[in-house]
Amino acid sequence: QSTIEEQAKTFLDKFNHEAEDLFYQSSLASWNYNTNITEENVQNMNNAGDKWSAFLKEQSTLAQMYPLQEIQNLTVKLQLQALQQNGSSVLSEDKSKRLNTILNTMSTIYSTGKVCNPDNPQECLLLEPGLNEIMANSLDYNERLWAWESWRSEVGKQLRPLYEEYVVLKNEMARANHYEDYGDYWRGDYEVNGVDGYDYSRGQLIEDVEHTFEEIKPLYEHLHAYVRAKLMNAYPSYISPIGCLPAHLLGDMWGRFWTNLYSLTVPFGQKPNIDVTDAMVDQAWDAQRIFKEAEKFFVSVGLPNMTQGFWENSMLTDPGNVQKAVCHPTAWDLGKGDFRILMCTKVTMDDFLTAHHEMGHIQYDMAYAAQPFLLRNGANEGFHEAVGEIMSLSAATPKHLKSIGLLSPDFQEDNETEINFLLKQALTIVGTLPFTYMLEKWRWMVFKGEIPKDQWMKKWWEMKREIVGVVEPVPHDETYCDPASLFHVSNDYSFIRYYTRTLYQFQFQEALCQAAKHEGPLHKCDISNSTEAGQKLFNMLRLGKSEPWTLALENVVGAKNMNVRPLLNYFEPLFTWLKDQNKNSFVGWSTDWSPYADQSIKVRISLKSALGDKAYEWNDNEMYLFRSSVAYAMRQYFLKVKNQMILFGEEDVRVANLKPRISFNFFVTAPKNVSDIIPRTEVEKAIRMSRSRINDAFRLNDNSLEFLGIQPTLGPPNQPPVS
């Protein structure tokens, strides 16, 4: 054994000892901020974070002294590899501080962002509770639109300049760490090097995601078509039978999980409800009961109970007006055997399953607690997300719900209840896959520089239409930052983990169900009470990051790579049923339709042909003038023709589909109300009335400033002098 390796071991022992304490202090300060967002807690978190960062930077520099090629022991090698990654510490001190400030500010904006009554600024709605409640339950098109738009307008717009800076700094950090960009840095979590037969490259991840997505697409397209038909019933006249789905109608603020669409889409509504929310409320469940039931599930497969500290220190309900907390559910491994969950739990089936998910993280954290500090992590990020999801697959089954008294003992399973169950599962599991894939693809492209920042929103909604079949209910210009309206984006979390975890969870489920001696279709498997399944899972969990994930996966499922087959097998009966349901429907979507298309007017502008060498450049200022001119025309029309004083502003003239050869569409909304689109016929009358004023503003005429569908005015824009 080389002296280098022995020295490295000694160095790592010392590191592990010191890291434990500093990391704990930093984590604790972070917990305090997340559960109580105050200026003082931000400062404490930053101070503790700075100490941890300085320590890591120093240790990372020291770790460079041990060349990896001279280390034989895999455990030592993996630790050094991890420590030699410099993370943000490669940035200059001022840039590192700036990045920290940006991250904290984005987190605070997201968690404290609110929408307030313009007439009474004291009257506000936070995302949680309030806006999320609307997006989970409302069937009122305009209430949903108001919540959807307000959140993006209030929060997304504030985040935009910060996110632009964040991209630059994170890319700089990644490149200094020898990655192509920050997306590549994130993909590094899946990289395996130097383990014969188990290597996996960052590029391979992109390939695997792309090709598995192609395999999932047919199932998703049929789910999409079915959901579209049901949404047409719920929102008559708001949905196109061949178009994309309006983004604000999809079950939550982001259209990430479609779970809440179940009541609108349930195939066999006369059957007992397998969404057991009502039963939980009737039986007076609370947050504590939800987590205790989740704990029982894990214990039943031979995994450990939560620690006493977990129950004492976790924050499982919204502190309400007492203090402001980050309400997005998170699981915390603070170190020193201190495990906690932060969640503003509501008594719903959705949160019952989320509790299993979060507790899955804690089980993984507890299982690898014996590993060296630097190897205490999931084999890859997707594994960490998959653990609780495996449990949720069992916990959601009618069999399991019956066993814990949430479904009546006389609940009978048949083909119809099976389809109900699978559809509910698909709304959550299948519905989210294109969302996840598209979001991360967009970020990867942004980090790579493939989407210039003056086209972020344009490309976001193009991709959303093409890949997800979802359309923006109102157009968003480049002042918005819609991706950052999601927790994971504004809080700097990679996201492809939710895609990979979904494939892994079905691979794991298949293997664990075999261990549990389950017979019958995969979707009926409930692994609770199977210690064999629990042991098989635990053997993987305890490894943490000490083995390549490809090897860990192979140990459990017998294959080294992600595979979509088990997921497709699980949903096979539903897919067959959906194909039958959709036989008279259009499957797929046209990306041309939008909810505002009917009220839009197309404009074509020909500067060169009209002005020749005197042609000016069409830029943001010209567009501002155009929108102001239309707003003027609207004010004039309402005042002169309708005797109504309505103060239209340029922000009420909404432009979409701007093309470089200068054409675009626009429509007009009532002041301060994005959901109130002024009928196209009214806008046409207003433009006709002020046409010459608009033409003059741009030194153009009816032919060079063309409003398609609006008859040209009678006289030429500039009267020639009478001779």
Epitope: P129, G130, L131, N142, E143, A147
Partner: antibody, heavy 121, light 109 residues
């Protein structure tokens, strides 16, 4: 089918208190905002108060702010209106109404039959 | 709050006639946020029209709504005997207060 049944109305002296209840059935109660709307004898409709589906947001007309309190018990599918410091001008039929919305005040697609509150000495 | 003014206060027409009821807001109201209700003596109000022009479930096609900005109209194309009642317009915005018009009484001539 949706049903809303008000109770608790009656004769009360000025300055007195009364608590109205509205028992709901036929829909997922916690998923909708609810309101109280009143109608003085021979007069038009006046919105009084609203509460979001979870009970997290409450709204009041200026005329009752500080005197009336709206609340709900989702486990019992029941809406309440606690009326204190009652005045003669609070005399009206009080309707419980289901909103089409969840959090913001909305339209009212279902109404109860009303309960009469008379404030008189 | 926004004041809703209905006109006329009373409208006397015969069955088969066309009825046009008007509602004017003191400031601009989103057409997404205007409704009409019908109330018969001794009964609770009933939602007729929402979002200015959409008929509520079970409402006959003879009822229609239109308008934007500050001026809104409820039209009953051909009056049936059961249509004689009081009609109220209501504005809801995203924040309270909700306000109703004072009502138009539609009576048999």
């Amino acid at each position: 089918q949706v049903q809303l049944v008000e109770s608790g109305g009656g004769l009360v002296q000025p300055g007195g208190s009364l608590r109205l209840s509205c028992a709901a059935s036929g829909f997922t109660f916690s998923s909708y905002a609810m309101s109280w709307v009143r109608q003085a004898p021979g007069k038009g409709l006046e919105w009084v108060s609203a509460i979001s589906g979870s009970g997290g947001s409450t709204y009041y007309a200026d005329s009752v702010k500080g005197r009336f309190t709206i609340s709900r018990d989702n486990s019992k599918d029941t809406l309440y209106l606690q009326m204190n410091s009652l005045r003669a001008e609070d005399t009206a039929v009080y309707y419980c109404a289901k909103a089409t919305t969840v959090v913001t005040p909305g339209y009212f697609d279902y109404w109860g039959q009303g309960t009469l509150v008379t404030v008189s000495s | 709050g926004i004041v809703m003014t209905q006109s006329p206060a009373t409208l006397s027409l015969s069955p088969g006639d066309r009825a046009t009821l008007s509602c004017r807001a003191s400031q601009s109201v989103s057409s997404s946020y205007l409704a009409w209700y019908q109330q018969k003596p001794g009964q609770a109000p009933r939602l007729l029209i929402y979002d200015a022009s959409n008929r509520a479930t079970g409402i006959p096609a003879r009822f229609s709504g239109s308008g934007s900005g500050t001026d809104f109209t409820l039209t009953i194309s051909s009056l049936e005997p059961e249509d004689f009642a009081v009609y109220y317009c209501q504005q809801r915005s995203n924040w309270p207060p909700i306000t109703f018009g004072q009502g138009t009484k539609l009576e048999i001539k």
